[in-house]
Interface confidence: low
């Protein structure tokens, strides 16, 4: 299953697949979740190790058994791959390290006046991988504002240096926000020349194309199909790259088929994992197990369940098969992709969904064994849960925010039903940014049920608590997926970094806005939530957030939207936007309903009709 | 000191190819851009391009792009910038300059081409 | 490309006298304004550049100000040295662009 928990001050011994710099343990843990055999990380932060040469180590590692002996080194940061958690699966990587200085080629030096400029400019650049920025402070004027676009061979930087005054990212052409655009197009017949940065072999020229997306260099590839001329040429797909970031030459060559990467597709790209399965075709690796299991579907099932399957065949052969079960072979090779593609077989074959970002049905929680006020300008895919809830009658209009915590269920506050419980009036929106992309012909959810907290009562700010289920799922993509839930019982205090979002009002007499504002928020205790509201009960099941001398807070429109926080790399639900005395009056908190507190009754109601829980519980 | 030696006059025939180096030293020659600014004879300045000689990246003024094309040696620390299919109105003083934080700080002392028949 | 528009094209002075050159980008180019001198068969010389930096070799009667499009070049007390061209150059946005160049000359 999916393990999120990061061990502290602990080193994984032995099984290293592969080693390289990462910044963060965040970004080394999406490198192992994306290596076709890490199953374990440990890295390494510079305060945890004097050896300059193993600082911002990132240590990718394999294990047969899943696990690995843990020995105590004080600063390292362990933990799992994110394969098979499904919406948690993501090559997105936002974050800016400031003191940081990410070593790598760099081909382009520009002039500009701040590090999202130069984050900007690093995702519209075809070969950008990550970038440096000097900012106006930096000790030599020389390289003031520099923005040093770079790249390398493994797409991480060839070396992290602790440098002041310097700031550091990636490009977020894996978050689908890149302004280049991409070629959906597949040319049959034609071959594409240039330099070639890898080989594998795959069933068809899309799997050939996912694999180029998701590679640091590929730009485009060549794949010869299994009637190509040279039979051991069959079935390779050759990963491609080039100077100006376009082949310099393409030959028509009957039996080929070539394209691109569809890295710098802009709001959506293909999920990291293949679904297909191909019908008489056998595909070879080495031997992980063979289970005996009825029909191919299930046989992929098992591959997925199997952490360290990376492909499968299902053998159809008699002597194969005992009454309806036949034989499934789970198998993984050095690269994830099969040592061998065989037609005209008895078999099925097809590869592991362990990549796959929709991943189960269920809600997402943490596992371990009202405009905003004083708020900024959101940007695309930044709140990816963050929905708006639209009323429809005569007009229609912005009414409260919500969040989306699986394929069909949204969570919001109570009190946005309140004179309006009739589910056929409601459109819920999801994936936008600005209220004004809304048109008559944008797609839209409808309510197939509410559900409002049994103990909520109209007027009263307790149990502010509702449920949405949707009419027909979501599918996940960067701009549209859901948050996190805490564990039952989670403690705030943890949670240092918090934020909430929505398009309410940005002044207590103002006006719903119409791009989604953000703002952050720290947390404040329930004692002194409730010195500031004498005349309410502030209980354990609400959660407080705000300045003391106010200026930012959620408002009217926000209600129902998220209170979200930062921990350990991962966002969670803490609270969602209820009630407070005005709009970011001083000494006046928000008040928010503490998710945490209804756990169980969300596990509950979002049981499906069968029985099966739509969620994984918090353990 | 930081100093850049450019190359000597050089007279061209239209159509020809004209190459003009420009040596560094006083300085990390990786570590800084080269750029090269022309100005035609009573004319203003002209930017036509830089290089980066750590990595060999290139970044051209579209106005130039397909004739003009900037190299590097970093065994001599000389940096070269040739324009070909040279015109009448390519008659100037090319200079490579060294920026320092954002503008140009230092200058070659200049190298005048003339295309004539 | 971001065009720069300096006036005037030539003024003449006396030495003593205040000298303001205008430069004006056709988009904003945030402060990333830099002023050259260039003296007959020279190379030019970095003069002034962003909100504060002023080159080393040159004398504080050489101001720059100016926000967004707008920037001007204030020679407080002009000085017989002075007599010059001065460019202003955009380093915002590439192509960086100059000036056509403001010719100061003793009246």
């Known amino acids: 299953g999916c393990l999120t928990q990061l061990y502290e001050n602990a080193f994984f011994r032995g099984g290293d697949v592969a080693s390289m710099y990462t910044p963060n343990a965040q970004y080394c843990q999406m490198r192992c979740t994306f290596h076709p055999r890490c199953l374990l990380f440990s890295f390494l932060p510079a305060s945890s190790i004097n050896d300059m040469e193993k600082r911002f180590g990132c240590f990718l590692k394999d294990s047969v058994t899943g696990t690995l002996p843990k020995v105590h080194r004080t600063g390292a940061v362990s933990g799992h791959s994110l394969k098979q958690c499904g919406h948690q699966i993501s090559a997105c990587h936002r974050d800016i390290y400031k003191g940081v200085d990410m070593r790598g080629v760099n081909f382009n030096v520009s002039k500009v006046s701040s590090v999202e400029e130069c984050q900007k400019r690093c995702t519209s650049n075809i070969r950008c991988q990550f970038f440096s920025y000097a900012t106006q402070t930096f000790h030599k004027a020389e390289y003031r504002n520099n923005c040093l676009l770079k790249y390398s061979p493994g797409g991480t930087p060839t070396a992290i240096k602790v440098l002041s005054n310097v700031e550091s990212g990636f490009s977020l052409k894996p978050c689908a926000l890149s302004e280049i655009g991409c070629h959906m197009n597949i040319f049959q017949h034609l071959a594409f020349s240039d330099v070639d940065v890898a080989r594998v072999l795959t069933p068809d020229a899309f799997v050939c194309r996912t694999i180029c997306t998701y590679h640091p260099n590929c730009l485009f590839f060549t794949f010869y199909t299994n009637v190509w001329k040279i039979e051991s040429q069959r079935n390779v797909c050759l990963l491609k790259t080039s100077e100006s970031g376009t082949p310099s030459s393409s030959t028509p060559q009957e039996n080929t088929i070539s394209g691109y990467s569809l890295l710098t597709c802009k709001r959506t790209l293909p999920e990291p994992c293949h679904s297909k399965i191909y019908p008489g075709v056998d595909f070879g690796g080495e031997e992980l197990n063979v289970t005996f299991v009825k029909g191919v579907n299930v046989c992929q099932e098992t591959c997925t369940k199997m952490i360290r399957c990376q492909f499968f065949t299902y053998s159809l052969l008699p002597e194969d098969c005992k009454e309806e079960k036949c034989k499934c072979f789970l198998r993984l090779s050095m690269d994830g992709s099969p040592t061998r593609i065989a037609y005209g077989t008895q078999g099925s074959s097809g590869y592991s969904l362990r990549l796959c970002n929709t991943g189960d049905n269920s809600v997402c929680t943490t596992k371990t064994s009202t405009r905003i006020v004083g708020g900024t300008n959101s940007s695309w895919g930044e709140w990816p849960w963050q929905v708006s809830l639209q009323v429809k009658l005569t007009a229609q209009r912005h009414l409260c925010g919500g969040s989306l915590i699986g394929h069909q269920w949204v969570l919001t506050a109570a009190h946005c039903f309140d004179g309006l419980p009739l589910q056929d009036v409601w459109r819920i929106y999801s994936g936008i940014l600005n209220l004004s992309d809304i048109t008559k012909d944008t797609p839209f959810s409808q309510i197939k049920e509410i559900i409002i907290h049994q103990n909520y009562k109209v007027s009263e700010g307790n149990h502010d608590i509702a449920l949405i289920k949707l009419q027909a799922p979501l599918n996940y993509t960067e701009f549209q997926k859901p948050i996190c839930l805490p564990s039952k019982g989670d403690t705030s205090t943890i949670y240092t970094n918090c934020w909430v979002t929505g398009w309410g009002f940005s002044k207590e007499k103002g006006e719903i806005q119409n791009i989604l504002q953000k703002v952050n928020i720290p947390l404040v205790t329930n004692e002194e939530c409730q010195k500031r509201y004498q005349d309410y009960k502030i209980t354990q099941r609400m959660v407080c957030a705000g300045y003391k001398e106010g200026g930012k807070d959620a408002c009217k429109g926000d209600s129902g939207g998220p209170l979200v926080c930062k921990h350990n790399g991962m966002w969670r639900l803490v609270g969602i936007t209820s009630w407070g005395e005005g709009c970011a009056r001083r000494e006046q908190p928000g008040v928010y309903t503490k998710v945490a507190e209804y756990m169980d009754w969300i596990l509950e109601k979002t049981q499906s009709s069968d029985g099966k829980a739509q969620m994984q519980s918090p353990a | 000191q930081v100093q850049l030696q450019q190359s000597g006059a050089e007279v061209k025939k239209p159509g020809a190819s004209v190459k003009v180096s420009c040596k560094a030293s006083?300085?990390?020659?990786?570590?800084?851009?080269m750029h090269w600014v022309r100005q035609a004879p009573g004319q203003g300045l002209e930017w036509m391009g830089a290089?980066?000689?750590?990595?060999?990246?290139?970044a051209y003024n579209q106005k130039f792009k397909g004739r003009v094309t900037m190299t590097r040696d970093t065994s001599t620390s000389t940096v070269y910038m040739e324009l070909s299919s040279l015109r009448s109105e390519d008659t100037a003083v090319y200079y490579c300059?060294?920026?320092?934080?954002?503008?140009?700080?230092?200058w070659g002392q200049g190298t005048l081409v003339t295309v004539s028949s | 490309d971001i065009q720069m528009t300096q006036s005037p094209s030539s003024l003449s002075a006396s030495v003593g006298e205040r000298v303001t050159i205008t430069c004006k980008a056709s988009?904003?180019?945030?402060?990333?304004l830099a002023w050259y001198q260039q003296k007959p068969g020279k190379a030019p010389k970095l003069l002034l550049y962003g909100e504060t930096g002023l080159e080393a070799g040159f004398h504080l009667r050489f101001s720059g100000s100016g926000s967004g499009t707008h920037y001007t070049l204030t020679i407080s007390s002009l000085q017989p040295e002075d007599f010059a061209t001065y460019y202003c150059q955009q380093y915002w946005s590439t192509p960086w662009t100059f000036g056509q160049g403001t010719k100061v000359e003793i009246k």
């Open positions: 988009e904003d180019i945030y402060n990333r």
């Open positions: 006083g300085y990390t020659f990786t570590d800084y851009e």
């Open positions: 300059a060294r920026p320092y934080g954002y503008p140009f700080a230092y």
């Open positions: 290089i980066h000689p750590g990595s060999g990246g290139t």
